[in-house]
């Protein structure tokens, strides 16, 4: 049905015939997400009318239906001025109980309104700064943290709680003040870790599940975002004791997380978010991740359950494969493989074997290859200083921050750019001082090392001199034509 | 006949070992000789990454070291604002205020008068009215037009706290200097059993017998390049613009017979003021036939390849090209934080309509 | 064809009540949204209250909320309006009529009912 013909029943005021013409608009539309410009006028007159009636009150047989049209309408950025009022978020959120109102919704919600508007919001928080904006004044974060700490005592349906979960996301991500009053005075970190555990279904001391089903995946998922949104610039903070002790707890979650498969092929997304919000835990709190107990089964090195490291590990693997999206998809992954190798010896003796093994092949560049440690050098000269940065100090940490041994393994060219904004590429050791990791050579490196180049880091044999055969004079010669760029160069 | 061996072939074996032995670690010492040539332009960061080795390192300048560079910094600014108020005049640009053409003449002459490492109050005054004056300012944005050092408006900025009399420069401060390097500055470095030396040159003819000694048997080439120096206008006396000056320059050295097999590390430095130039100046000033976008990555990976695509013998000679950002000493503790943004970004972007 | 007649105004003191009926006609009344909206002398046409067909859904302006109660009869075919607490500035002429709007369609709304509020 034309959106002309909606807009004109809607004008009669019929109101039977109003929702059957809205039921055919939805059932032509429920897939558009792109609208044709021919009509947008109607559409926009249509959106006008339908917000009235929204701010006036929907009859309850019909409300579904209208939300959904209003669904289907926010998706179209020209109507999205209509909407994003005052009035119809109120409205909005008052079906969607997650209005802070004074009279409170006398009869329990229907769970279909509920969810219908709960998109609603999603697509106008996603889509408009000024639903964002009303969204944060109305103080719609209180009520939605009110109700996920609900998730225990009252059961809501997966959807229902997907969606709170995801508006939850949304205000957090484009909203610092949403951030702060959920981090701070709504402790989003105890209740969000809570969520997490009961979503996952596991008590800390239990073995990891095996597959995390569809539905439990997609919420976790949502709620690793959040707590990545309210975390990443408050952790940067010292944490006394008992927050320490929750980031520890939250960090045996993201354990499991790490350690489980996601239903669906979502295994490598969830793993994503789960390492970004690793990256945001407390330094002193990444020591869970090390923390497992040995059992049946389990990869242990120096006494202690390597498993998650192990899973870390192969999920840099798997990322490195990218070329889309390099910085978000190896920097967190690396960064916190770093700082579990930065604090903890067997971490680092661990990874140190599986990245960096003692040398053999001498004859090839460290960055030619398709080895872990190929790959990591290689990004050691990217263009994106940031990427350049994390895989650099990575493999400078596995070396214990020894400049003759990073050049070793990396070649100086391929090392200058962390030397040079360290400060190092003239040598000495910097403060962080490791218990001193020994280094084996094996016996073809030995054999190799005199006709290795420390700047390629590969045996080279002594190239004949240019100059071979030149009287002093000529080489004079050249060297002045040298010293006459340089000099101009340096005017 | 059988494979032992009788006494006096085991010792001659033994022997064998111990003279390969002796040579290997003989030729070991030569080899693990490292002899790095640092070259760049003027304002390239080339002396940066020098004094960048020192703060970092070392615990930094110690405050009698800092307190050296005081005549520096004082040199610096008042060459900045100069530099300014000279191309005012060639760009045609008036003073927002007309007074300031008194300041301007009071400049010159207290310059000329000023002791070194002093600075009076009278001509810090002077200074910092003309520095807030709206025509000294349009001319300082019009900064490409003309030759002016970089940290410019870092001295003029804070000319209140340079100006004290008890000032003591800063590690930024120190880092922020810019001295005409002349000759050949040599250091030597030790990293385990590799031994280093570094010639940082400078230009300036010096004696012809200490350049030989330099060039011959070059392990590496550090070359320095400032992108930002990208939209620089020719000056009167410049046939080309400075990057193509350095393009050129690299060319010559990295296909030079002396340098045959020299791998050369390419230091394309200042990032950060060029990722803020990219959006204002685009890169087809310097590079006409240029047909990307100005954003930062792909401009940057653009003159990458400008200066990579220059060697001529890709098969044995490797280019190491790192982007840095060498007046930055805070970048260099480890921090993911510029990542986070990204990661909200995205994670907004995978979020669809319903 | 459509009818709307409203009745119950009247001079009335600040505080006292009225309450406005309208018998509307020509159309299926139990399937429409009615509404009530007033006209000030000198003044445009202001929505005042609005309910659904079933007559669960209600909806006023700020103006008149809590003092106002909008109600219908589908069985009589009539459309109330209680007034309590009645101020001066709810002296206007009061129309009922079909639909969310205040349709300009002459058919959609009645003659109208003055209601003075005066002491």
């Known amino acids: 049905m034309e959106p002309r013909a909606v807009a004109d029943a809607l004008e009669t005021g019929e109101e039977d015939a109003v929702t059957e013409a809205l039921r055919s608009f939805n059932r032509e539309h429920s897939q558009s997400f792109t609208f044709d410009d021919a009509q947008q006028e109607d559409r926009k007159r249509l959106a006008k009318l339908l917000v009235s009636v929204l701010e006036q009150g929907l009859s309850p047989k019909h409300r579904v239906t209208w939300l959904q049209t209003i669904r289907i309408l926010s998706r179209d950025r020209s109507c999205l001025d209509s909407f994003a009022s005052r009035q119809s978020l109120h409205a909005l959120a008052c079906y969607a109980d997650i209005a802070i109102s004074e009279e409170p919704i006398p009869q329990p919600p229907d769970m279909d309104v509920l969810l219908e508007s709960l998109k609603c919001l999603c697509n106008l928080v996603l889509s408009s700064p000024t639903a964002q904006m009303l969204a944060a004044e109305a103080r719609l974060v209180v009520r939605l943290a009110e109700r996920v700490g609900l998730y225990r005592k009252r059961s809501y349906p997966h959807e229902v709680q997907f969606f709170d979960l995801r508006l939850l996301f949304l205000l957090t991500a484009l909203r610092t003040d949403v951030r702060q009053q959920l981090f701070q005075e709504l402790h989003g970190v105890r209740l969000l870790t809570d969520a997490l555990e009961l979503t996952l279904g596991v008590a800390p001391k239990e073995n990891p599940l095996v597959i995390l089903p569809a539905q439990e995946t997609e919420r976790a998922m949502e709620i690793l975002k959040v707590l990545f949104n309210i975390t990443y610039d408050s952790v940067k903070r010292e944490v006394d004791e008992e927050d320490a002790a929750l980031y520890r707890y939250l960090g045996t979650l993201l354990r499991h997380c790490v350690m489980a498969d996601a239903a669906g092929d979502r295994t490598e997304e969830f793993h994503g978010h789960t390492v970004n919000l690793l990256g945001n835990l407390p330094l002193k709190c990444l020591d869970v991740l090390l923390a497992l107990e040995l059992h049946e089964g389990s990869l242990e090195f120096m006494g202690v359950n390597m498993d998650v490291i192990n899973a870390l590990l192969a999920f840099l693997e798997k990322r490195l494969h990218q070329t889309h999206r390099l910085k978000e998809c190896v920097a967190p992954v690396l960064s916190v493989l770093t700082e579990c190798a930065r604090m903890h010896r067997p971490a680092r003796k661990f990874l140190k074997a599986q990245v960096l093994p003692p040398l053999r092949d001498v004859r090839t560049r460290p960055e030619v290859g398709d080895l872990l440690r190929n790959k990591l050098v290689r990004l050691m000269t990217h263009l994106d200083t940031d990427v350049k940065r994390v895989a650099a100090e990575f493999l400078f940490v596995l070396c214990s921050e020894s400049v003759p041994r990073f050049i070793k393994y990396t070649g100086y060219g391929n090392a200058a750019g962390l030397l040079a904004a360290r400060g190092l590429m003239a040598g000495g050791r910097p403060e962080g001082q490791y218990s001193e990791d020994e280094d084996t050579d094996t016996e073809e490196y030995r054999e190799a090392k005199a006709s290795i180049n420390p700047v390629t880091g590969r045996v080279e044999e002594k190239p004949p001199n240019p100059m071979e055969g030149m009287t002093e004079e000529q080489k004079e010669h050249e060297a002045m034509k040298l010293v006459n760029m340089f000099d101009k160069l340096s005017r | 006949m059988g494979c032992t061996l009788s006494a006096e072939d085991k010792a001659a074996v033994e022997r064998s070992k111990m003279i390969d032995r002796n040579l290997r670690e003989d030729g070991e010492k030569a080899a693990r000789e490292v002899k790095l040539l640092l070259l760049g332009a003027g304002e390239s960061g080339k002396s940066t990454i020098v004094k960048q080795m020192k703060i970092i390192h070392e615990a930094g300048y110690s405050e009698e070291e800092c307190k050296q560079y005081k005549a520096v910094v004082y040199s610096n600014t008042i060459q900045s604002i100069i530099a300014i108020i000279r191309a005012m005049g060639r760009l045609k640009i008036d003073f927002g205020d007309a007074a300031r053409a008194d300041d301007a003449r009071q400049l010159f002459v207290l310059a000329g008068a000023a002791e070194e490492g002093f600075m009076t109050a009278e001509l810090a005054g002077v200074i910092k009215r003309l520095w807030k004056d709206s025509g000294v300012q349009a001319c300082f944005n019009r900064s490409r037009e003309y030759q002016l050092n970089d940290s410019a408006a870092y001295y003029l900025n804070d000319l209140d706290r340079i100006a004290q009399p008890n000032y003591i420069p800063t590690q930024q401060d120190v880092l922020r200097t810019r001295v005409k390097t002349t000759g050949i500055v040599e250091t030597h470095f030790t990293f385990k059993d590799l031994h280093f030396k570094m010639f940082d040159v400078g230009g300036q003819r010096s004696e012809r017998k200490k350049w030989i000694h330099c060039f011959e048997g070059v392990t590496a080439i550090i070359f320095c390049v400032a992108l930002s120096d990208y939209d620089l206008v020719l000056a009167e006396d410049e046939e080309m613009n400075r990057m193509h000056e350095s393009m050129k320059l690299f060319d010559s050295i990295c296909n030079n017979k002396w340098f045959t097999d020299t791998s050369i590390i390419l230091f394309l430095n200042k990032k950060d003021l060029f990722e803020e130039k990219i959006k204002k100046s685009p890169l087809t000033i310097c590079y006409p036939e240029y047909a990307g976008s100005n954003t930062y990555e792909e401009a940057a990976a653009y003159i990458q390849c400008q200066f990579e695509d220059l060697n001529k013998r890709k098969d044995t000679k490797e280019i190491y090209t790192h982007f840095t950002c060498a007046t930055d000493t805070k970048n260099v503790q480890f921090v993911f934080d510029a990542v986070t943004d990204v990661i909200i970004k995205n994670n907004l972007k995978d979020c669809g309509l319903f | 064809q459509v009818q709307l007649v409203e009745s119950g105004g009247g001079l009335v003191q600040p505080g006292g009540s009225l309450r406005l009926s309208c018998a509307a006609s020509g159309f299926t009344f139990s399937r429409f949204v009615m509404n009530w909206a007033r006209q000030a002398p000198g003044k445009g046409l202001e929505w005042v209250s609005t309910i659904n067909s079933d007559g669960d859904v209600t909806s006023y302006a700020d103006s008149v909320k809590g003092r106002f109660t909008i109600s219908r009869d589908n069985a009589k075919n009539t459309l109330y309006l209680q007034m309590n607490s009645l101020k001066p500035e709810d002296t206007a002429v009061y129309y009922c009529?079909?639909?969310?709007?205040?349709?300009?369609?002459?058919?959609?709304r009645g003659q109208g009912t003055q209601v003075t509020v005066s002491s």
């Open positions: 009529g079909k639909g969310w709007f205040l349709n300009r369609r002459d058919e959609s």
